[in-house]
């Protein structure tokens, strides 16, 4: 008996061939001997089966001795043995229809789990193997689960269902809802304007939700809500903004915030959360601000940084075009009685300058 695998919702064509290459009488029946369709001369006739409105044939092939049964919009319950009667012969084809669906939604938040469920006909024992867009293979039976979805899991998942040494392939598009970056750091000199950007890693037609930026300043004992906003059809509208600092927010995606000036009291870490409509959970992006200040008070030249710096960062004070006078893995360095000239305060990571502030020291007479 020939086995054909079909996909739920698709169209399948079951073949039936006569030895005579001409149009002769044929019938397709199901395992209960109920007629599905056949012919009467050059006319297609249909029986009382439940496939009535979804069954068809190709009349153009009858003259060649081919009498296919076409079943549209396949359902799991269409799985059956179909019998083609032609020239006093019976050809049997076993059709097995499978369906593969993602749990609840194909748009999932980063960190959530994806469950793929296989619908299969009674009596079948299929195996399923899925390949994620990043090349990870998972195997299972009726259900497959992937916990802790990552951004790289966005894309087309290709799943192969194997039954009776035949296979059928499913493609499921999964969108992992997340920010492009989990964390970012902005380095600024005191007084400079600060821009924070929160690009999303996905695009959808309409995007609705609400968000908030909480800020933990290094100098503050507790965190503070800096801004709350709504997102409707991709348009951003500010609901509430703190008076200090007076943030500005762009009205279009990607989410974008501007701080008029970097000040030591703003240095710290923020957490932007975005709750999307009809989704449980929130998207998060961490943002960090490091602020540098170089000052000269009487005979003391000081350079300080505030904010979340890593212990391996180096803070240096040097006279332009000269070797560093002082270089430490600390958040403040100073030089007593600095000589006249343009001094540079540098914050660097393995030789790469992250932040630089210049201060002119005038000669003392």
């Amino acid at each position: 008996k020939k086995v054909v695998l079909g996909k739920k919702g698709d169209t399948v064509e079951l073949t039936c061939t006569a030895s005579q290459k001409k149009s002769i009488q044929f019938h397709w029946k199901n395992s209960n001997q109920i007629k599905i369709l056949g012919n009467q001369g050059s006319f297609l006739t249909k029986g009382p089966s439940k496939l009535n409105d979804r069954a068809d044939s190709r009349r153009s092939l009858w003259d060649q001795g081919n009498f296919p049964l076409i079943i549209k919009n396949l359902k799991i319950e269409d799985s059956d043995t179909y019998i083609c009667e032609v020239e006093d012969q019976k050809e049997e084809v076993q059709l097995l229809v499978f369906g593969l669906t993602a749990n609840s939604d194909t748009h999932l938040l980063q960190g959530q789990s994806l469950t793929l469920t296989l619908e299969s006909p009674p009596g079948s024992s299929p195996s399923v193997q899925c390949r994620s867009p990043r090349g990870k293979n998972i195997q299972g039976g009726k259900t497959l689960s992937v916990s802790q979805l990552e951004l790289q899991d966005s894309g087309t998942w290709t799943c192969t269902v194997l039954q009776n040494q035949k296979k059928v392939e499913f493609k499921i598009d999964i969108v992992v809802l997340a920010f492009q970056k989990a964390s970012s750091i902005v380095y600024k000199k005191e007084g400079e304007q600060v821009e924070f950007s929160f690009p999303l890693a996905f695009t959808v037609e309409k995007l609705t939700g609400s968000g908030e930026l909480w800020w933990q300043a290094e100098r503050a004992s507790s965190s503070k809500s800096w801004i709350t906003f709504d997102l409707k059809n991709k348009e951003v509208s500010v609901k509430r903004v703190t008076q200090d600092p007076k943030l500005q927010m762009g009205k279009k995606l990607p989410l974008h915030l501007t701080l008029p000036q970097a000040l030591p009291q703003y240095a710290g870490s923020g957490n932007l959360t975005l709750a999307l409509e009809a989704k449980t959970g929130k998207l998060h992006q961490e943002v960090n601000l490091v602020v540098m200040r170089a000052t000269q008070l009487q005979k003391n030249l000081t350079c300080e940084v505030w904010g979340p710096t890593s212990p391996k960062l180096m803070l240096s004070l040097k006279l332009e075009n000269k070797e560093a006078k002082v270089s430490k893995r600390e958040k403040a360095v100073w030089v007593l009685n600095p000589e006249a000239g343009m001094w540079q305060c540098l914050l660097s990571d393995s030789g790469q300058v992250l932040l630089e502030s210049n201060i002119k020291v005038l000669p003392t007479w």
Epitope: Q193, E195, K232, N233, E235, S237, V238, Q248, M249, G250, K251, K252, H256, T258, P260
Partner: antibody, heavy 118, light 107 residues
Framework: EVQLLESGGGLVQPGGSLRLSCAAS????????MSWVRQAPGKGLEWVST????????YYADSVKGRFTISRDNSKNTLYLQMNSLRAEDTAVYYC???????????WGKGTTVTVSS | AIQMTQSPSSLSASVGDRVTITCRAS??????LGWYQQKPGKAPKFLIY???TLQSGVPSRFSGSGYGTDFTLTISSLQPEDFATYYC?????????FGQGTKVEIK
């Protein structure tokens, strides 16, 4: 063809009221934000107000906040600007504009003139 | 509110000239900037959005550039129909603000 036609302008005394209308055609009105922009005689362009699409968020310039009200009737494809407590400095040509998908004002009407004078 | 400063306020040029108009924002506005052209007695015409994207139907002699606070509108070879007033508009957030305009006149 996308078209915007303003009406309702005229001469009004200071402290008076006026309601401007803008009839839209040639596009799916309910899916786009709409705005009013004005231009005083011999002066530059000044944004007045915006109403987002069917959600209906409204935004105003500080100079008109509390006096002007923007609204829309999606069933009639019409945008309105209710202007109360009018002042001499509100004298201008008022343009109705349509926002595109990127929220830029891409289509403008021909304008209607509002004169506030005693 | 974000202030938009346009310069020059007016300029005289001849047909075929290359013309540059600049617009400066009082704070960073990404590339959320549009350019409009207005002729006397007419409604403004939309030329450029997102700082550098030409609106369909606008001749390719018009181009825009910039990001953050500094933006430029360039007309590579001025044509007779280009004599008009040009406005920049910040579309970063509300209130939307226009530059004061640059009048391009015939020399």
């Amino acid at each position: 063809e996308v078209q915007l036609l303003e009406s309702g302008g005229g001469l009004v005394q200071p402290g008076g009221s006026l309601r401007l209308s803008c009839a839209a055609s040639g596009f799916t009105f309910s899916t786009y934000a709409m705005s009013w922009v004005r231009q005083a005689p011999g002066k530059g362009l000044e944004w007045v107000s915006t109403i987002s699409d069917n959600i209906g968020n409204t935004y105003y310039a500080d100079s008109v906040k509390g006096r002007f009200t923007i609204s829309r009737d999606n069933s009639k494809n019409t945008l309105y600007l209710q202007m109360n407590s009018l002042r001499a400095e509100d004298t201008a040509v008022y343009y109705c504009t349509k926002d595109n998908e990127d929220y830029y004002m891409d289509v403008w009407g021909k304008g209607t003139t509002v004169t506030v004078s005693s | 509110a974000i202030q938009m400063t346009q310069s020059p306020s007016s300029l005289s040029a001849s047909v075929g000239d290359r013309v540059t108009i600049t617009c400066r924002a009082s704070q960073g506005i990404r590339n959320d900037l549009g350019w409009y052209q207005q002729k006397p007695g007419k409604a403004p015409k939309f030329l450029i959005y997102a700082a550098s994207t030409l609106q369909s139907g606008v001749p390719s002699r018009f181009s825009g550039s910039g990001y953050g606070t500094d933006f430029t509108l360039t007309i590579s070879s001025l044509q007779p129909e280009d004599f008009a007033t040009y406005y920049c508009l910040q579309d970063y957030n509300y209130p939307r603000t226009f530059g004061q305009g640059t009048k391009v006149e015939i020399k």
